[in-house]
Interface confidence: medium
Amino acid sequence: KFSKQSWGLENEALIVRCPRQGKPSYTVDWYYSQTNKSIPTQERNRVFASGQLLKFLPAAVADSGIYTCIVRSPTFNRTGYANVTIYKKQSDCNVPDYLMYSTVSGSEKNSKIYCPTIDLYNWTAPLEWFKNCQALQGSRYRAHKSFLVIDNVMTEDAGDYTCKFIHNENGANYSVTATRSFTVKDEQGFSLFPVIGAPAQNEIKEVEIGKNANLTCSACFGKGTQFLAAVLWQLNGTKITDFGEPRIQQEEGQNQSFSNGLACLDMVLRIADVKEEDLLLQYDCLALNLHGLRRHTVRLSRKNPSKECF
């Protein structure tokens, strides 16, 4: 019960608070549990105890382990445990799940993202913010105190947000980063009978024999979370995978887009080396969800080669 998980990255500052609380006047002793060795309080040490706080300035992977804190008062002792894990810095942009702090949700009306654990540190503005590793730029984003405010929140704002700040200890600066996911709550989400934006019903697509052709099936299903929905192509009423023509394949286009808040899907049908017999097939773009199924049919016609003038 009185154990707390803490994590950080090597060469960054990490400050951990004892899970057992006490008055500021109470003394707190820290120990490295594996060896029962006392953690020094002298600030010249890279790892030192400062009352309720255990400071790693900076942290190293080898610091990982369980630390015991004992809050001592004249009448009682309280024991807590800090389970500390220090990870190597990632070479790529992805932040693994084990480095993520709790997910926060926002909406058009409320879009504050607090920088996790920042209250433990001695930091000064500016607080830098990144989304999916890209520095946030533009008037919609405002770093305010220890949180980020996003104006006019859109579905595209969902993602992983990293705050970066500098901790100052006795004139020395240490970098700290923390990442959490932000989800956007759809306050007026809805689902509707699929609407196919492309192709048009009974569209005729001109193709050249021997060339490649692409057909895109694009449909929207509503706004916000769509529970069960799909777009796919059929040839003469048969699924592409069952039709058995390796020249004709379907692949996801933009697997989910939320332009204007609408939830849409694309499926691209790729026909390699168009043949005469392809002109005889019926191509059906299907969009389906729990409301039902909508079908738009396309046929191919031969494109007349452009006549050149001599």
Partner: nanobody, 116 residues
Framework: ESGGGSVQAGGSLRLSCAAS???????MGWFRQAPGKEREGVAM??????DYADSVKGRFSISRDSAKNTLYLQMNSLKPEDTGMYYC?????????????????WGQGTQVTVSS
């Protein structure tokens, strides 16, 4: 997920799973994992179809509520071999209906224990 718990053999439980976030889920399903065993598919639902593992056919029923973005698994005539951790999964990529690798969003799991 929610709805798990302990029950006597022959009893019933109803699991539920709420989908959230800005996603379009092509299909959703229930998987289970017994201690020391591989994760296995139990029941799957897409927009137009449902499918069940042979071991649960006739006893389990999958349903969905699009208004609540929720998937349910009604489990009747439970047997001790149904014991395990039950996971709700969403597939947002085209793939194989019964392969856990083709589901890219997983719930935390809910424990179901059936005693004889």
């Amino acid at each position: 997920e929610s709805g798990g718990g302990s029950v006597q053999a022959g009893g019933s439980l109803r699991l539920s799973c709420a989908a959230s976030g800005y996603t379009i889920n092509y299909r959703m399903g229930w998987f289970r994992q017994a201690p020391g065993k591989e994760r296995e598919g139990v029941a799957m639902a897409s927009a137009i179809s449902e499918d069940y593992a042979d071991s649960v056919k006739g006893r389990f029923s999958i349903s969905r509520d699009s208004a609540k973005n929720t998937l349910y698994l009604q489990m009747n005539s439970l047997k001790p071999e149904d014991t395990g951790m039950y996971y709700c999964a969403a597939g947002r990529v085209w793939g194989r209906l019964w392969n856990p690798d083709d589901y890219n969003s997983w719930g935390q799991g809910t424990q179901v224990t059936v005693s004889s």
